[in-house]
């Protein structure tokens, strides 16, 4: 039985939106139907409609299409909004420019390469021919348009009015012709959709013939209409997934515009000793990765073979051997030295500070009044009057309403980390504002600390060394994979988070991770019946330096006598010193024969003051770190394990006092480690907890 | 555009080998990466091994380091899978995948352009 062909794919979509008659004499046709590709078929080849179609609206409410004999751009109709319509229109009929011969073009030019007007096709005067619309039906011989109904060499042509002359291509350009790009087009949002090879693109909303991650809801900003070609992911140009099963995607035929300069709101802000964002614009001269491996130079093809070459990415200032971002990927990076690695982060690099001016706050912010009305990953601030029921779920004293105007950043509920706000995003509900605290401001945020000073961490590699094999109940260890590797430690600190540090996640797409639960090996041996594997739905990061992020699961963990939670310390606590505490990991650690099974070292806490003398000075901590020296010679964090848990015992509890993140040296004697301090951070964790939707079970 | 044709599967003991070839026509060869994957019903497609166009550079999946080696004879057109060792495990549909461009990765489906229509590799214990 031969398959029927998805039409939808012919179709411009125009989400929310309807098409109203406002000329009685125009026909519609209805009939109930399940989906919007059953429309596009039926429309497509006309089949039981009375008129040709050119657009239809699918009615999501009622089941239902709607089909019609014009569209948007006919006289007689106006477009109208409507939550439940979708109006697709043909784009044969919208299109001004072909696709190889023109056999598809509809519309409406009616004259010839030299100007003379074209002759009704109906009309056998002043030339008779045998190009009768009933002869050609579906080729659309309306009025005197210009059409190609056999597919001819030249394009779409038509008879002319002019006696002397019988008939005359016109002049309609290609579509390849009409459409450019600058630099790799990824700003295009042109309407080429098929590719260099004729293929007919499949719509980014469907998953047919290839399923992808490019999905229009998940990516807002990327253009993803209808089938048009788009570069989302730093490809050498425009790209669409195709109908052809055996060719995934391919490239699109879009040339370069004469003035291959960028839009201003295109270019990324140039920074040389920081990053901003993602790190599009960073042009310094940083060239090693997180952990100190040389980068590869991108005009070489040794050790790493790749097309990320100068030659291809023009724009992108893909000098020497230095990190840069030419693909939109999380941040800076550049292929490495080590044959074994591809490609690393350069997450050395500082972020560029956001605070806007002078605009900044002393303390935790709480009389900010500044008119800053957007979070700091660019959200605009939604209004204090309409999220005031939210508001009230998580403070417990009525909020001071006068300080609440408008949208703008504030702190009514006395956070420790500075003004913030409510977005209109659903999965992202509320989120900080890019303000600083005011230069010379030491107001401590929290009470019972030494005097808080700023922190000049470095990153080096952590793993726990030397440490023995666990063999306790430690059911709230996670390992997180990253493209089916284990790459970081976490805690699971509610059934649907866990608690890990930033640097654990090399891209943005969530479906490179899974998080592990339940097992001992880091292979997974011997774990089957414990282990619960769950993808990851949701990063939300940390205040601004916290290196802190929470990891929402896709669904819940189901608690059992392999998988269970650890407590958070109430905030701003303060453990006593000498209190013994572990560290957990599956780094490789030390051992010749590693064998991949979790390891435990035992560390005692030590005062800011004396982990800074041992750090020979070197070293000042800050409020929102936590010390812990080893209590034998080389054996404390490494790399592999940053994301796991410091883990301390008071009154008989466990909980998870601190975080390894990249910092400060990896078991060298008479060198504590410093980890993020957790009950700096508690409220913060529980304010997410509380006001970030989770999956039900 | 890139037609390719996988041969050379079939059922095998564990233990045994098998030489997977995949013949390409209809483009530059010679200017492709090439790649297999495998996939077993209801599950995705996963990487198994990759080749650079020149040659040089090959990547492996960990679960099949030290028994399969991907090899390529750009004159024939034509790139191999030698698997050693075989292991139930293994009994997948594999398939060959061309790419034109390699960027920060090479390992995964999104980089590889043209398919071919897979061969069949079954591994009794």
């Known amino acids: 039985q031969r398959k029927r062909r998805n039409t939808i794919h012919e179709f411009k979509k125009s989400a929310k939106t309807t098409l109203i008659k406002i000329d009685p004499a125009l026909k519609i046709k209805t009939k109930k139907v399940n989906t919007a590709d059953q429309c596009a078929n039926r429309c497509t080849r006309n089949k039981g409609l009375p008129f040709t179609c050119k657009a239809f609206v699918f009615d999501k409410a009622r089941k239902q299409c709607l089909w019609f004999p014009f569209n948007s751009m006919s006289s007689g109709v106006k477009k109208e909004f409507g939550h439940e319509f979708d109006l697709y229109e043909n784009k044969d009929y919208i299109r001004n420019c072909i696709i190889g011969k023109g056999r598809s073009y509809k519309g409406t030019v009616s004259i010839t390469k030299s100007g003379i007007k074209c002759q009704p096709w109906s009309s056998m005067i002043p030339h008779e021919h045998s190009f009768l619309p009933s002869s050609y039906r579906g080729k659309d011989l309306q009025e005197n348009y210009c059409r190609n109904p056999r597919g001819e060499e030249g394009g779409p042509w038509c008879f002319t009015s002019n006696p002397e002359v019988r008939y005359e291509v016109c002049d309609i350009p290609q579509c390849s012709e009409v459409e450019c790009m600058t630099c790799n087009g990824e700003s295009y949002r042109g309407l080429m959709d098929h590719t260099e090879s004729g293929k007919i693109c499949q719509r980014w909303d469907h998953q047919t013939p290839h399923r992808h991650k490019f999905l229009p809801e998940r990516y807002p900003d990327k253009g993803f209409d209808d089938n048009y070609c788009r570069n989302p992911d730093g490809q050498p140009r425009p790209w669409c997934y195709t109908l052809d099963p055996h060719t995934r995607w391919e490239y699109c035929a879009i040339k370069t515009c004469a003035d291959n300069t960028m839009n201003d709101t295109d270019v990324p802000l140039e920074t040389t000793e920081c990053i901003q964002g993602q790190g599009e614009g960073y042009r310094g001269t940083v060239n090693t990765i997180w952990n100190g491996i040389p980068c590869q130079r991108w005009d070489s093809q040794y050790p790493h073979e790749h097309d990320m070459t100068p030659e291809n990415f023009k724009c992108k200032d893909l000098r020497e051997n230095y990190c840069r971002n030419p693909d939109g990927s999380e941040s800076p990076w550049c292929f490495t030295t080590d044959p074994n690695i591809r490609v690393g982060y350069c997450s050395q690099i500082p972020n560029c500070d956001m605070s806007h001016g002078q605009d900044c706050y002393r303390g935790n912010g709480k009389n900010y009044m500044g008119n800053l009305s957007q979070t700091r990953s660019g959200l605009t601030c939604s209004m204090w009057d309409k999220n005031m029921e939210d508001l009230h779920r998580h403070i417990f004293w009525e909020p001071d309403a006068s300080k609440l105007n408008e949208n703008y950043c504030r702190n009514p509920d006395d956070d420790a980390h500075g003004p913030w706000c409510y977005t209109g995003n659903p999965l992202i509900p509320w989120d900080y504002c890019p303000i600083s605290r005011c230069e010379g401001d030491t107001t401590p945020t929290i009470v019972n600390l030494d005097h808080p000073v700023i922190s000049c961490a470095k990153t080096k590699q952590l793993r726990v060394v030397n440490g023995i094999p666990t063999r306790t109940n430690i059911g709230w260890m996670v390992s997180l994979r990253y493209r089916n590797k284990h790459i970081c430690g976490g805690s699971l600190i509610k059934e649907s988070w866990v608690l890990t540090a930033r640097q654990c996640f090399p891209s943005r797409d969530l479906k490179d991770y899974e998080a592990w639960l339940g097992i001992h090996d880091v292979h997974g041996r011997g774990d089957e019946k414990c282990k619960q594997v769950l993808n990851v739905s949701q990063l939300v990061y940390g205040p601004e330096g916290s290196d802190l992020v929470l990891m929402k699961l896709a669904r819940p963990a189901v608690l059992d006598d392999f998988v269970s939670t650890i407590d958070l310390p109430n905030y701003g606590c303060t453990i006593p010193e000498k209190t013994s505490c572990s560290v957990y990991g599956w780094g490789y650690t030390g051992l010749i024969n590693y064998d991949g099974l979790l390891r435990v070292a035992h560390l005692y806490i030590m005062g800011n003051e004396k982990c800074s003398q041992h750090h020979r000075g070197k070293v000042t901590l800050n409020e929102s770190e936590i010390c812990a020296g080893a209590e034998k010679i080389g054996s404390g964090p490494c790399e592999g394990d940053y994301g796991g848990p410091l883990v301390c015992e008071q009154h008989k509890m466990r909980m998870v006092l601190g975080v390894i993140v990249p910092g400060r040296g990896c078991a060298i004697p008479n060198r504590p480690g410093i980890f993020v301090r957790v009950a700096y951070y508690a409220k913060w964790i529980h304010k997410i907890i509380l006001t970030y939707k989770v999956p039900q079970s | 555009e890139v037609q390719l044709v996988e041969s050379g599967g079939g059922l095998v003991q564990a233990g045994d080998s098998l030489r997977l070839s995949c013949a390409a026509s209809g483009g530059t060869f010679g200017s492709s990466h090439m790649a297999w994957f495998r996939q077993v019903p209801e599950k995705e497609r996963e990487f198994v091994a990759a080749?650079?166009?020149?040659?040089?550079?090959?990547y492996y999946a960990d679960s099949v380091k030290g028994r399969c080696t991907i090899s390529r004879d750009n004159a024939k057109n034509t790139v191999y899978l030698q698997m050693n060792s075989l292991k139930p495990e293994d009994t997948a549909v594999y398939y060959c995948?061309?790419?034109?461009?390699?960027?920060?990765?090479?390992?995964?489906?999104?980089?590889?352009?043209?398919w071919g229509q897979g061969t069949q590799v079954t591994v009794s214990s």
């Open positions: 995948a061309a790419a034109r461009f390699w960027g920060s990765t090479s390992t995964r489906m999104d980089d590889y352009q043209y």
């Open positions: 080749i650079s166009r020149s040659g040089g550079t090959t």
